[in-house]
Structures are given as C-alpha cells and as structure tokens.
C-alpha cells in the first residue's frame, strides 16, 4: 500500500505545524485568523483567566477517566460558568437545613443566557470546593425534581485530604433538562450517604460557600469559590454543523518521551503560536506541546514464521492485525485557549490537540 | 513520507487474514495451533456454552461504556464462573433476612481454584438475574467487610421491566482482595437505596435464586441462573508476560458499512476459521466479522488555502493534524472463543479483534 522513503524530520515537523494551523482554524470554524483591531489593551480580565484556569483544571483531571464523546466535540466548545444563587435568596428558606444535606440552587435564566438551546450543551459540571477533610465521607448528589422531591444522580467516596480540593460532578443531562423545561430556579442537594440500617450519618465534608447544617447557621462566602456550574457548549452560530457519530477521549500515557526508540513513538514538538504560526491572536496559552507520532510499524507475515519470537512482535508492531500498520496517536488531550472576537474575550477548548502517546494501528 | 500505489484489494484482504492468523495465536501465546487429537466427540458441554454465551452478552453491552484497559488485556483472558453458595449453607443464618436486603456468599477456595493469583484477575463481574419488575428500583451493592459490617460498592437504578434481565456489577477490586486475603466465605449484599430522610424502602426487585426476605421464606432455584461471579483472568502459564502500559477499549460505531465511500472507511471482511485459516480448533464461533480499514486520508496544506471549504475537510481527513494521516481502526471490539487444550474446553476472550469504525489519524 505504501513504500517508505528516508524520513526528512524537518519536513515532518513543518507538515505537522501547518496541519495544526488548519486544525485550529477548522475547529473554531474560522476561515482566517480573527482581526485584532478592537482588542482592548492590557492583561486579560481576571474573570476570563479564572475561567481559562477552570478549563485547564478540567483537562488535567480528564485523561484518567476516558468517556464517549459525540462527534460534535471535535469542534471547539465555548466555556461559561454560572454561580450558585446566593444563600440569602428565599429559595433556601423552603428547604430546612439538616445535618445530612446542603442545597445549591441555580437561576435557569442565567443558564439559558449561556446556552440558548439544550442541544448545544456538550458538558455541564457542578464544581464544589470541598474543604480539608479529616474522615472518609460517602456523599450523594440529588437533583430537585418536583416541588419537594429529589432524584438521585450520583455518589462519590471522598478520601481524607490535607487541603481544599475541587469536586466535579457531571450533570450534563440534568442541565439539558433544565434548559428545555426547567422552572425559574432549579437545584441540587449534596447529602451524606445513609444505608437502610445506619441512618445517623452526618455530612462531615464542608463545601466552600456554606457551613453545614449541623452548625445551624448558613454563611455564604461570596465570590468565585462558591459552587458553580461549568458549561461547555457549541456557540449558536456553529450549531448547524453538528453531526451525530462519535469520537473518543483517550488515555493519558507518556511512555515514549525521552526515548531513543527508532520504531513508532511519540516525538516532542512544542508549538509557539507567535514564532511557529505567526499568530498573535491566541492570548493564552503562548504555545503548547503538540507532539507527533513517527516511526515504522513493520508488517509481520505470520504464515511462514509461526514461532514464539515473531508472534511476540504482534503486540508491539501490529496489535490490531492491520494489513498496513501505521504509527498513529493513541492518547490525545484537549487544549483550552483564550482569544478575542472583536472586543470580546472567549475561552474555548479544542479537543484532541496534544498527542500523549502513539501506537501501531 | 509515503507514496501511494494502486490498491490491490485482494492483497490487502490476504494480508489482513494472515495478520489475524498471527494475532490470534499471539494473543493466546501459542506458537502453533493446538493439537485436536484428544478432543472428545460430540457437541460442546452445556456449561461451556453457557459460559461462552455469558461472555458474548458481556461483549454486547460493553462498547457503550469504554474504560481504560491495562496492556495485559491485549492477551486472551480465560473465563470462568463461580456460583453463589447455596442458600441452605449456614452462613446465611448469620445474616437476618430483612425487607431491604438480600445476601450472596461465595466460597473463596472456588475463586482461588479459578484464579490462583490476585494479579492474574483481569475482571470480575457479579451477575444477577433480576425477574420482571413493576416499579423503578434504586439498589446498592455492598461487600462483606468484617464480621458484621458492610462496605458500599456501587448502585444501579433499575427500570421497570416486563421480562427477566441479567444485571452485572464490576467487582474486580473486591474479588482481587478476597483472592489475596479473604476468609473462607465472602459475600455481597444487595439493598434498596435509602436516603437519610426516607428510610422505609423495600427491596422490590426479585433476584433469581431468592424470594426476598419480606416474604419470609428463602427459596433457592438451583442451577445456572442463581447469582454467580464471572471471572476473566490470565492463565498462570501466561502470567510472566504481563506488562503495565495501557491500551484502550474503544466506542462502538458502525457508520461506514454499506457505504460507497472511496476515502478512509471500514470495509467488511468475514473470516471463516475453517475456510480462510484452515483451522478446526476454534469450536465457537465458526467465524467472525473482522473487517478492516482502507481508503486515503489526504494531507491538506492549509497555508495556501485558508478558506472554509478546505478547512471543513480537516474533520474528515486529518482531525489529528497529522503530518501523514493514515486510515486506522477507531472502534474495536473483543471476540470470545471456545477451543480445546487436550481434553479440556476453554472459553477465552480476545481483545480488539473486530473493527467497528475507522478514522484518519
């Protein structure tokens, strides 16, 4: 199917860099880099940086738990966040504080402002800052369902911890529901896990923004660190291009770096947006480790050579039993970026941008 | 990097078939096909077929939930099952029947017979046949921890159903624990989910092998359909080859079949073990849809052609922005097989055998 030539490493790198130029623009559905004429001077607004950092946190924790992604996730997602309604809102008076639960409510008009159509929502995460925890705590998350009933969503076993830590719950389905038919204010309940024969559990974990009900008072810590919904959605103008087939988020492995391997391996490539692409329009990050895959994947003719030594090579060189094995990315990671459209800063996440490992396929 | 030649479809198929010959032997760590001299005549034993079908059921439900797989999962796994200790065993007398729980105990000596070393265990599933259910039921699974305490493992929301259905819980970690330091008899508890403020829940679901405690009596249905542990493990003789790097199980997509697409796509290829490989030693299945990937993935030079039409091609032809995009499998599925070693039938599962979709990478 193909014949090998001597590899020109510089040409490979140039082709990879040029492919990335097109890839980024393609993911953002931009025909050309956006004009920088209206960009306000000075550093990025703090809120934008906070949002960018939230997205980076999400990326860091992501590769450990691969999950299916719709094809639509090829395209960049606009990232927004909606803070929990402050605890002096009357909605909180309707739900008596207890030793085993705390309540978090959200204004659906704010959600709809961020995501006008339910179908545009790609992912929604409930983010909670848990304070230092001295005992293991099993918690459950519920969704406000009808007036006074709660629907179980998920659970988490929280390990003891020496410092505060962000918790993230995937609530995509719930938020999609709220966007399509939610009331004015919708909410979640975080509760201690109670089994049918031990019901005296107390919610030991403190969530920033509350002191738990067992203390009787409900103190709000204002600002960025109270519970919020992190939303990733396709912008409305990009919506008509959605497709329904599926991509996957891969595993994070770095087994190849700093190796002298001649066969298929991941190779280091740092792309500086300004130097390599001549771009000033991406404000954060300044560049990223794109990397690329390179090296031969020999085909093994098993017919004439069926003995252990040759068969052992299959796992390395042709695990998928391909007719023409090829060195391709195995694990990819997303890249969040900050750029301006006119005077407006945008935080978007580009999927499958960083090659973490390669495989013969 | 490579130059294209006219594609000889027959050569591609032959190379794929021969690669599969080596792949199967390699996954089983066999230097050559096993001798069939001692294979007993007649059909496969019913227990072996039941086990094979359990494995096939597992495969069918699998691609919907991809999860990380250790590199060791490249190699075939031996599949066994251990039935729940019958309910007339005295262990059941120690745990009072209640309206909210049922108990299932297992003999660890049987587990150790199936899997001599904890490290060999690749996956363990608790399989329960739930009878038809007229109400939605939220259940929780617990593990027997010390004499009379129970550790929460997982939960499931069971939808109402008009017919019996197998439930499967991943209990790999628990069984691995039992293999290394378990008592003589270990067990699980299936309970109704109770929240801290609604504690009167009854276990409404009937599990084959019991009538739940609320009926007072405890009837055992003997045979294959009482709760069991489905175990997948590396056979002892194959253990020294385990590695720790990671592979992934992909998503199930079938978007390419019966398409006239000339570019990269999944192509149909059925392999009949007897006709195509001259093999009589695989007793089940008789063959399988291996399929393969074929078709060009053009590289796009974005530098000179930054306009929407060309950029739109990135998603299809070079989503990973590769310097030399290649048509490779995206979604792969495992294949369970039945074969004999001497007089002994074996059920083993071969990972990543069936190509469900392709991608340019």
């Amino acid at each position: 199917l193909s014949t090998c030539k001597t590899i020109d490493m510089e040409l490979v790198k140039r082709k990879r860099i040029e492919a990335i130029r097109g890839q980024i623009l393609s993911k953002l559905r931009l025909a050309s880099p956006p004009s920088q004429g209206e960009v306000p001077p000075g550093p990025l607004p703090e809120a934008v940086l906070a949002l960018y950092n939230s997205t980076r946190d999400r990326v860091a924790g992501e590769s450990a738990e691969p999950e299916p992604e719709p094809e639509a996730d090829y395209y960049a997602k606009e990232v927004t966040r909606v803070l929990m309604v402050e605890t002096h809102n009357e909605i909180y008076d309707k739900f008596k504080q207890s030793t085993h639960s705390i309540y978090m409510f959200f204004n659906t008009s704010e959600l709809r402002e961020a995501v006008p159509e339910p179908v545009l929502l790609s992912r929604a995460e409930l983010r909670l800052l848990r304070l230092k925890l001295k005992v293991e705590q099993h918690v459950e998350l519920y969704q406000k369902y009808s007036n006074n009933s709660w629907r179980y969503l998920s659970n988490r076993l929280l390990a003891p911890s020496d410092s505060p830590e962000w918790l993230s719950f995937d609530v995509t389905g719930v938020v999609r529901q709220w966007l399509s038919r939610g009331g004015e204010i919708e909410g979640f309940r975080l509760s201690a896990h109670c089994s049918c024969d031990s019901r005296d559990n107390t919610l030991q974990v403190d969530i920033n923004g509350f002191t738990t009900g067992r203390r009787g008072d409900l103190a709000t810590i204002h600002g960025m660190n109270r519970p919020f919904l992190l939303l990733m959605a396709t912008p409305l103008e990009r919506a008509q291009h959605l497709q329904s087939s599926r991509h996957r988020r891969a595993l994070d492995t770095n087994y190849c770096f700093s190796s002298t391997e001649k066969n298929c391996c991941v190779r280091q490539l740092y792309i500086d947006f300004r130097k390599d692409l001549g771009w000033k329009w991406i404000h954060e990050p300044k560049g990223y480790h794109a990397n690329f895959c390179l090296g031969p994947c020999p085909y093994i003719w098993s017919l004439d050579t069926q003995y252990s030594k040759v068969l052992a090579l299959y796992n390395q060189h042709n695990p998928g039993a391909s007719a023409a094995p090829c060195c391709v990315p195995q694990a990819l990671e997303p890249l969040p970026i900050v750029y301006y459209v006119g005077r407006k800063p945008k935080v978007e996440q580009l999927s499958n941008m960083i090659v973490r490992s390669c495989k013969c396929s | 990097l490579s130059t294209c030649k006219t594609i000889d479809m027959e050569l591609v198929k032959r190379k794929r078939i021969e690669a599969i010959r080596g792949q199967i032997l390699s996954k089983l760590r066999l230097a050559s096909p096993p001798s069939q001299g001692e294979v007993p005549p007649g059909p496969l034993p019913e227990a072996v077929l039941a086990l094979y079908n359990s494995t096939r059921d597992r495969v069918a439900g699998e691609s919907a939930e991809p999860e990380p797989e250790p590199e060791a999962d490249y190699y075939a796994k031996e599949v066994t099952r251990v039935l729940m200790v019958e309910t007339h065993n005295e262990i059941y007398d120690k745990f009072k029947q209640s309206t909210h729980s049922i108990y299932m105990f297992f003999n660890t000596s049987e587990l150790r017979e199936a899997v001599p070393e904890p490290v060999l265990l690749s996956r363990a599933e608790l399989r329960l046949l739930r009878l038809k259910l007229k109400v939605e039921q939220h259940v929780e699974l617990y593990q027997k921890y010390s004499n009379n305490s129970w550790r929460y493992l997982s939960n499931r929301l069971l939808a109402p159903s008009d017919s019996p259905e197998w439930l499967s819980f991943d209990v790999t970690g628990v069984v691995r624990q039992w293999l290394s330091r378990g008592g003589e008899i270990e067990g699980f508890r299936l309970s109704a989910h109770c929240s801290c403020d609604s504690r009167d829940n009854t276990l409404q679901v009937d599990i084959n092998g019991f009538t739940t405690g609320r009926r007072g009596d405890l009837a055992t249905i003997h045979g294959m359909n009482r709760p069991f542990l489905l175990l997948m493990a590396t056979p002892l003789e194959r253990a020294q080859h385990l590695q720790s790097s990671r592979h992934r199980r992909a998503l199930d997509t079938n978007y390419c079949f019966s398409s006239t697409e000339k570019n990269c796509c999944v192509r149909q290829l059925y392999i009949d073990f007897r006709k195509d490989l001259g093999w009589k030693w695989i007793h089940e299945p008789k063959g399988y849809h291996a399929n393969f990937c074929l078709g060009p993935c053009p590289y796009i030079w974005s530098l000179d052609t930054q306009y929407s039409k060309v950029l739109a091609l990135y998603n299809q032809h070079n989503p990973g922005a590769s310097a030399a995009p290649c048509c490779v499998p995206q979604a792969l599925e495992p294949l369970p097989i039945v074969y004999y070693v001497g007089r002994k039938p074996k059920v083993e599962q071969l990972s990543n055998m069936i190509v469900r979709s392709c991608k340019c990478s």
Partner: antibody, heavy 116, light 110 residues
C-alpha cells in the same frame, strides 16, 4: 491522653515518644503532635487522621514520623539535633462536633533534651 | 502557604476590661480557625473553633469572630484567671505549611 518517652539524648540518637490514650478509640479521632521550645510558642509537627493518613509541617522533611496502634500514637524523631529540645504535646481532635481539626484534649507534655 | 500572624505580641489589660486579639491569615481560610489559651507549665486549652463556636465548658466571655483572612478573639469582663498566652490555629490546609499556629499573644492583668 498521656505522653511518655521524653529524656536526655545525644544528637543523632533516634528517639520515639509515645502517646497513650484511654476512654476513646483512635479509629474515631485525629491526633496531633505539637512541640514548644522553652519560652517559645507552639510549633505544629504533624497529624494522623482516624483513617491513618499522616500529614506533616513543611519543615519536618522526614525528620519525624507519626504512626499509631489501637491505643497509642508514636512520634519517631529519626536524628535529633539540639534545636529539637522542647516539650512535646500529643492532642486529640474534637471529633464529629466539627468537620475541622481542632484539639480539645491535650496531654501534659513530655520533655526532650538534646545535648552532647 | 497559610501563615498565621497574631497581633499584638503582648497586651496588658485591667480586671473587668476587654481585650481584643487579632489573627491574620496570609490567604483566605474561610472560617476554619480555632483559639487556644495556654498558661505556664500547662498544655493549651481549646476555647473557640470554626471561628466562632464556643468549645464545651468555656465561658461566654470569650467570643470569636471573622472569616476569610481577618479573625478576632475578644475577652470581655477580664478576670485574673485569663492571664495566659493565646494562640490561633488554622485548619484550612496542611499543604506547604510551616506552622498551623500563630505566634501567640501574651495577656497580662494589671
């Protein structure tokens, strides 16, 4: 809660202090070690949670190790220096009355003198 | 790091008077703060935890307030028995922390 094991040691001689508890279970409470040099303030060394997790002050750097049995909490000083001369206190957390770790039951302390 | 700074280092107060001790955290610690009293030759005694909750058996003359980075311990109707050194303690994080306790404030009675 009572500390023991404090004595005069020469620099570099390993020393283990023991905190013996009664009337409560260590599987339900976090325990801490705090020291106080003569005429100085309280200096936190580290904590062991009910579940066994241990956390140390930044400066500890492997010089101290906290461990426990069912009724004792040990503090091992791997290689004492003269700067480790102090009264060493062991204290128990308030337990489930707060999700924070605060210490409401303290031992009387045990004096460690490091001198050549 | 979450460093705790106490002011003043020492204070003199008349019997029946009121004394205010401040504790400042280098970063926000929410309300994860406790106050202790220590008398010479004795171990510390817990007075207040979670910034404002009075510990069991402690006189209501002791009052804790504040959240975030600024905290205050107020002793009203001071008695001779209140002569001691007072320490604050943060419980927000142990990571990269040199000391969870403040430097102490010595209260002397005139």
């Amino acid at each position: 809660v009572e500390e023991s094991g404090g004595r005069l040691v020469t620099p570099g001689t390993p020393l283990t202090l023991t905190c013996t508890v009664s009337g409560f279970s260590l599987s339900n409470y976090a325990m801490t070690w705090v020291r106080q040099a003569p005429g100085k303030g309280l200096e936190w060394i580290g904590v062991i949670y009910a579940g066994g997790n241990t956390y140390y002050a930044n400066w500890v750097n492997g010089r101290f190790t906290i461990s426990k049995t069912s009724t004792t909490v040990d503090l091992k000083i791997t290689s004492p220096t003269t700067e480790d001369t102090a009264t060493y206190f062991c204290a128990r957390d308030v337990g489930s009355s707060s999700s924070g770790v605060y210490f409401n039951i303290w031992g009387p302390g045990t004096l460690v003198t490091v001198s050549s | 790091a979450y460093d705790m700074t106490q002011t003043p280092a020492s204070v003199e107060v008349a019997v029946g008077g009121t004394v205010t001790i401040k504790c400042q955290a280098s970063q926000s610690i929410g309300s994860r703060l406790a106050w202790y009293q220590q008398k010479p030759g004795q171990p510390p005694k817990l007075l207040i935890y979670d910034a404002s909750t009075l510990a069991s058996g402690v006189s209501s003359r002791f009052k804790g307030s504040g959240s975030g980075t600024e905290f205050t311990l107020t002793i009203s109707g001071v008695e001779c028995a209140d002569a001691a050194t007072y320490y604050c303690q943060q419980d927000y994080s142990y990571r990269h922390v040199d000391n969870i306790f403040g430097g102490g404030t010595k209260v002397e009675i005139k």
